[in-house]
Interface confidence: low
């Protein structure tokens, strides 16, 4: 085979709900013809399955072949460099890819105002790749929690936090007016999954939203 190719230095998964992406770092001094072979092993079926013979990118979307992740014991992946007839040794992910490795996200956050309260509704993710019965709430059926961060604009550093246990929440604005910006980070109390903060959603509160009660 001539000179041996170096192996990819590292291989890892970055995953959100039904969005499972394998990443790797390139070999040093790769040529224009260098590509990467990807293989996948499902725990319980102890054989490697070739997924891609020649990927020229540094990532590969494995969602379609790991759709049963949330009902399985997990996966490992491996990648090797290929250049013509030469190939490197395999580099294997150093941890099992399981439901625990999935970063939790929300789909979106909707805000409205009612009598001085900001009412929020968290929309759960609905990825197109997910099988019909595999909803976020069926897979994470208990102990869903959300950290809510509220920022009043202007004032980048004056904000509050609260944790809620439902997809609907309310925030009392203490009679203040102005623009309020809200972000949400999901978690599941019984699990160790990391959560990703949602994009900021803002809503303007003016005096017209307050009703006077005697």
């Amino acid at each position: 085979h001539g000179t041996e190719l170096p192996s990819p230095p590292s291989v890892w998964f970055e995953a959100e709900f039904f969005h499972h992406i394998l990443h790797w770092t390139p070999i040093p001094n790769q040529s224009e013809s260098t590509c990467y072979e990807v293989a996948l092993l499902r725990y319980g079926i102890e054989s490697w399955n070739s997924i891609s013979n020649c990927s020229q990118t540094l990532s590969y979307d494995l969602t379609a072949v790991t759709l049963d992740l949330y009902h399985s014991n997990g996966y490992r992946a491996r990648v090797r460099a290929v250049d013509g007839s030469r190939h490197s040794n395999w580099t294997v992910t150093n941890t099992r890819f399981s439901v625990d490795e999935v970063t939790l996200t929300v789909g979106s956050v909707n805000l409205e105002i009612h009598n001085g309260f900001i009412l929020g509704k968290i929309q759960l993710p609905r990825p197109k790749m997910a099988p019909a019965n595999d909803t976020y709430e069926s897979i994470f059926s208990h102990f869903r929690e959300y950290e809510i961060a509220i920022r009043k604009v202007p004032g980048n550093f004056t904000f509050t936090h609260k944790k809620v246990k439902h997809e609907n929440f309310s925030l009392l604005t203490s009679g203040e007016v102005g623009e309020f910006c809200v972000q949400v980070k999901p978690s599941v109390a019984s699990r160790s999954n990391k959560g990703m903060w949602s994009k900021e959603e803002c809503i303007s509160l003016t005096r017209q939203y307050f009703t006077v009660t005697n």
Epitope: A149, R151, F159, K194, W197, E200
Partner: nanobody, 126 residues
């Protein structure tokens, strides 16, 4: 996997100084919120000082003017210089980091950190 390891705690007389360090490893993100939090026995965990990836800092009112947070990006180490220590500063001090995208502004009320160290004890006697 991200790991945070605190050091530098100990016992000191009121008015003395300590410097806490937190070594961070296992991440390559340029955007982060890192900080020091503390928990005294029987009390809730509270924010002490935080630093954002742009270098902006924020302090709890109780430590302003006495504590200074800083980060050495080359060494991937977070520091907390604590001067004029008081007995009420006695607590377990934790280093924490949030490396997520879209995070809210980094502030001392921010308890939504993804990664926490195991803590280092600071005891200030009168």
């Amino acid at each position: 996997q991200v790991q945070l390891q605190e050091s530098g705690g100990g016992s000191v007389q009121a008015g003395g100084s300590l410097r806490l360090s937190c070594g961070a490893s296992g991440y390559t993100y340029s955007g982060y919120c890192m900080g020091w939090f503390r928990q005294a026995p029987g009390k809730e965990r509270e924010g002490v000082a935080v630093i954002d990836s742009d270098g902006s800092t924020s302090y709890a009112d109780s430590v302003k003017g006495r504590f200074t947070i800083s980060k050495d990006n080359g060494k991937n180490t977070l520091y907390l210089q604590m001067n004029s220590l008081k007995p009420e500063d006695t607590a377990m001090y934790y280093c924490a980091a949030d490396l997520g995208h879209y995070r809210p502004p980094c502030g001392v009320l921010y308890l939504g950190m993804d990664y926490w160290g195991k803590g280092t004890q600071v005891t200030v006697s009168s």
